[in-house]
Interface confidence: low
Amino acid sequence: QSGPLPKPSLQALPSSLVPLEKPVTLRCQGPPGVDLYRLEKLSSSRYQDQAVLFIPAMKRSLAGRYRCSYQNGSLWSLPSDQLELVATGVFAKPSLSAQPGPAVSSGGDVTLQCQTRYGFDQFALYKEGDPAPYKNPERWYRASFPIITVTAAHSGTYRCYSFSSRDPYLWSAPSDPLELVVTGTSVTPSRLPTEPPSPVAEFSEATAELTVSFTNEVFTTETSRSITASPKESDSPAGPARQYYTKGN
């Protein structure tokens, strides 16, 4: 017995984080010779029977979850993983700082603090140069970032966003960039650690204190690395899980 039609991939170009009024293209990619594509916005009646959706100017109403599938003959493929399209610049930018400072010795520890004047309960941190994150919504509820040994791979420019779990696809503008400098090392690891983090991070309602920890576990499709945080849930042994399903993840 041959298997089902394989699921297509769905990606946002140039990024799934889209500033308001900026363009983005959603592209559904299946095998050659597809008869029909269907690209839809979940939790709405919007869909189109085309592989590419060009959005010339991002709007709040267009943020959300998207999924696609394709048809060959009478058969429909399995659905793509969900893509979550985020509108940024909806709220004022938070501030990003490093504790004890933005210069850290190799092997030392550093904590990045993302702070907002709003009562937001969610924060996202990402490193410049990585592809924009393709996130899984459950991760808005994961505040699990262990202290790790900093390496040269952690050097770079960081920004953070803040937003509310009530509107997880509407983010603030990015913070001003923070340059993290790792001193006393000359070797850059060829790859990052892959062990998932354990739940240790805690912070107050409007302040996210994140120990820098990049693993392939945090929301990623290719080589992107991004981390998010939210208040710790002590009754959840595995760390908080998202309250609704939207895979696009």
Partner: antibody
Framework: QVQLQESGPGLVAPSQSLSITCTVS????????VNWVRQPPSRGLEWLGM???????DYQSTLKSRLSISKDNSKSQVFLKMNSLTTDDTARYYC????????WGQGTSVTVSS | DIQMTQSPSSLSASVGGRVTITCKAS??????IAWYQHKPGKGPSLLIH???TLQPGVPSRFSGSGSGRDYSFSISNLQPEDIATYYC????????FGGGTKLEIK
């Protein structure tokens, strides 16, 4: 050929933890997700949770406080851990591939009893 | 969470006959429904996904239809090997099974 095989302890004492391993072959865990489903005696199927190809997880809301799903891509294994077991957790536990669960294991029977 | 109400919970039919099972979702699931056959001692088998797409190797006497909140699954030309319990599954938002329908042959 796609295959999934569950392995578990068989018997677990109340209030203890349950750990089950799903070993897969014929597909990559970096691309496909794996679900966990159970069936209590003489009852229907119940979805427990899922781990996606990129490592993210989804859990049934009533179980998420005591459920954890993880995986080891290099060993082609997915792990289910459930804490604070009661006799209501007695069931046959299945792992199944991705959405909408096109391939299933045969299941492993778990009895919660003292 | 989305609830799936499956009916009937059991039914009996004759060889060569036709049976229909229905599932009603508590909200619009946008055709993201699958149907499974489950026999004792085995893992469930996926028959249909996305409302009406038959899995490769599944006989065409199995069919599915529906939209919005209401979906149905039918077996025509019933065969003795069709004795099993059948489940619907929504996968639009989390995953939820229907309660199951036990099919017996008269």
């Amino acid at each position: 050929q796609v295959q999934l095989q569950e392995s578990g302890p068989g018997l677990v004492a109340p209030s203890q933890s349950l750990s089950i391993t799903c070993t897969v072959s014929g597909f990559s865990l970096t691309y496909y997700g794996v679900n966990w489903v159970r069936q209590p005696p003489s009852r229907g199927l119940e979805w427990l949770g899922m781990i996606w190809g990129d490592g993210s997880t989804d859990y049934q809301s009533t179980l998420k406080s005591r459920l954890s799903i993880s995986k080891d891509n290099s060993k082609s294994q997915v792990f289910l851990k459930m804490n604070s077991l009661t006799t209501d957790d007695t069931a046959r536990y299945y792992c199944a591939r991705d959405l909408p669960m096109d391939y299933w294991g045969q299941g492993t029977s778990v009895t919660v009893s003292s | 969470d989305i609830q799936m109400t499956q009916s009937p919970s059991s039914l009996s039919a004759s060889v060569g006959g036709r049976v229909t099972i229905t599932c009603k979702a508590s909200q619009d699931i946008n055709k993201y429904i699958a149907w499974y056959q489950h026999k004792p001692g085995k893992g469930p088998s996926l028959l249909i996904h996305y409302t009406s797409t038959l899995q490769p190797g599944v006989p065409s006497r199995f069919s599915g239809s529906g939209s919005g909140r209401d979906y149905s699954f039918s077996i025509s030309n019933l065969q003795p090997e069709d004795i099993a319990t059948y489940y619907c599954l929504q996968y639009a938002n989390l995953l939820t099974f229907g309660g199951g329908t036990k099919l017996e042959i008269k």
